[in-house]
């Protein structure tokens, strides 16, 4: 996988009036490493690993750059015409990548009310607009505003990409994304019984890198895909990842099932606890992982945040 640096910014408007401030977070190699504190108006480390490795200068620089980007995004939102009443959002995702062959990529993507309306390649300055008439109108609105804005030149896009790559290289050198291996902690639980069946869930947590195989086996043989339910592999905020797999089995057949895990050349099988050792979860056995808001405003205002 290529090394990547990604910034996610969002500004909001209420009844046509653009709100002050903005929301932002940063990801390094898919891991959250930066969050923007809206109250203190500062970029802060996300997770102990970022805090330990990146110095104060990083957060000063990031604060300056994010403030500038946030202001740009707010100005862009003011130029989006026909904003109906209520709450609206404009989101920008900016990504730069360094691939194994040392080639680079850079792009940014804009979403209005959670809907993608413009993608730009920062290296070629090519733009892509989805087919929908709403996206076409929004893209035209925004690009027309940028044409009037002297800052939005090709030189500016190149500088944007160069700046992103420079940061990515600096962060990689400082060892934030050292390719260490952290083996997963695996734990198997059983949910309540219904109609003679139980749901067994196998959770792998605190592992790095993110590539993992997690599957249920019956008598040593992998169950078919359609009998298993997988969760996404998600960052857990500590520079490591978590995921799960679940399946339904007949009560009394626990001994036949094991959760098989393979990660970075290591593997293990984990049996279903049975009899007195059976771990019963509470009724809440839903496995949906919600994107936790960067800030309470997300939850309160139910804004869709694109990862």
């Amino acid at each position: 996988e290529p090394h990547s640096l990604r910034y996610n910014l969002m500004v909001l408007s209420q009844d046509g009036s653009v709100q002050s401030g903005f929301l932002a977070e940063g990801h390094l190699d898919g891991q959250p490493f930066l969050r923007y504190d809206r109250q203190k108006r500062r970029a802060k480390p996300q997770g102990q690993w970022a805090e330990d490795v990146l110095g104060a200068k990083t957060w000063d620089t990031e604060t300056e750059d994010l403030t500038e980007n946030g202001q740009d995004l707010r100005r862009t939102l003011t130029h989006i015409k026909d904003q109906k009443g209520g709450l609206h959002s404009l989101q920008e995702i900016r990504v730069c990548e360094i691939h194994e062959d040392s080639s680079t990529r850079g792009s940014r993507h804009f979403y209005y009310d959670g809907e993608l309306f413009l993608s730009q390649n920062l290296e070629t300055q090519e733009s892509t607009v989805p087919q929908s008439s709403r996206a076409q109108t929004l893209a035209m609105n925004v690009t027309n505003f940028w044409k009037e804005d002297a800052m939005k030149t090709k030189t500016h896009y190149r500088a944007m990409q160069a700046d992103c790559l420079q940061k990515l290289q600096r962060y990689l050198k400082s060892g934030v994304a050292i390719r260490r291996t952290v083996p997963p902690m695996v734990n198997v639980t059983c949910s309540e019984v219904s109609e003679g069946n139980i749901t067994v869930t196998c959770r792998a947590s605190s592992f790095y890198p993110r590539n993992i195989t997690l599957t249920w086996r019956q008598d040593g043989v992998s169950l078919s895909h359609n009998t298993q339910q997988w969760g996404d592999v998600l960052p857990d905020g500590n520079g490591t990842y978590q995921t799960w797999v679940a399946t339904r089995i007949r009560q009394g057949e626990e001994q036949r099932f094991t959760c098989y895990m393979e990660h970075s050349g290591n593997h293990g099988t984990h049996p279903v606890p049975s009899g007195k050792a059976l771990v019963l979860q509470s009724q809440r056995t839903d496995h949906h992982h919600h994107h936790h808001g960067l800030n309470d405003i997300f939850e309160a205002q139910k804004i869709e945040w694109h990862e």
Epitope: G220, V221, E253, R256, T258, H267, G268, T269
Partner: antibody, heavy 118, light 107 residues
Framework: EVQLQQSGPELVKPGASVKVSCKAS????????IYWVKQSHGKSLEWIGY????????VQNQKFKGKATLTVDKSSSTAYMHLNSLTSEDSAVYYC???????????WGQGTLVTVSS | DIQMTQTTSSLSASLGDRVTISCRAS??????LNWYQQKPDGTVKLLIY???RLHSGVPSRFSGSGSGTDYSLTISNLEQEDIATYFC?????????FGSGTKLEIK
């Protein structure tokens, strides 16, 4: 190439015990179960049980509980089946087998003939 | 325990023939049916798993079919090297059980 090499033939007296070995090679031993199967002379096959080499967990056919004990030695990638209190009924060829994770008894050992006779 | 019945204990056929060996389970085994070949020297090989999936390296002249309680193994073009005893086995319910075997001979 996956290979299961079993120990040689055994001639044992009634009441004695025997330990059949199955040395695995060509794959990561702790990844896949080892299964044991019995074939009495001129008869069909009977599943005895299996062991998960990673954690030593076993699942057995009730019929063979108390008769067969399954163990592994991870350091030598070898599975063992210990048969006790032998009688003429235990005279048979015993096979070990393993899986590729997709099918049962995917690869088989060559079999070990155990003869119980006074 | 689930009983696996192979009614034909031995079968004679000529080289090039299409041969079908059947196997019946005493209850529905939901396609968890495997076929094994045992050569006269005792060597055992997996041929087909999950009713119809051909194990890697097994010639395509072997095929399997069936559902519920009735299953079959077909050899489309019998060759000399196919002379062996064929066993079916269910993997649906413990204990795993095998059929009594069908010995295939050349006419």
């Amino acid at each position: 190439e996956v290979q299961l090499q079993q120990s040689g033939p055994e001639l044992v007296k009634p009441g004695a015990s025997v330990k059949v070995s199955c040395k695995a090679s060509g794959y990561a031993f702790t990844k896949y179960n080892i299964y044991w199967v019995k074939q009495s002379h001129g008869k069909s096959l009977e599943w005895i049980g299996y062991i998960d080499p990673y954690n030593g967990g076993t699942v057995q056919n009730q019929k063979f509980k108390g008769k067969a004990t399954l163990t592994v030695d991870k350091s030598s990638s070898t599975a063992y089946m210990h048969l006790n209190s032998l009688t003429s009924e235990d005279s048979a060829v015993y096979y070990c087998a393993t899986t590729d994770g997709y099918s049962l008894f995917t690869y088989w050992g060559q079999g070990t003939l155990v003869t119980v006779s006074s | 325990d689930i009983q696996m019945t192979q009614t034909t204990s031995s079968l004679s056929a000529s080289l090039g023939d299409r041969v079908t060996i059947s196997c019946r389970a005493s209850q529905d085994i939901g396609n968890y049916l495997n076929w094994y070949q045992q050569k006269p020297d005792g060597t055992v090989k997996l041929l087909i798993y999950y009713t119809s999936r051909l194990h890697s390296g097994v010639p395509s002249r072997f095929s399997g079919s069936g559902s519920g309680t009735d299953y079959s193994l077909t050899i489309s073009n019998l060759e000399q090297e196919d002379i062996a005893t064929y066993f079916c086995q269910q993997g649906n319910t413990l204990p795993f059980t095998f059929g009594s075997g069908t010995k295939l001979e050349i006419k």
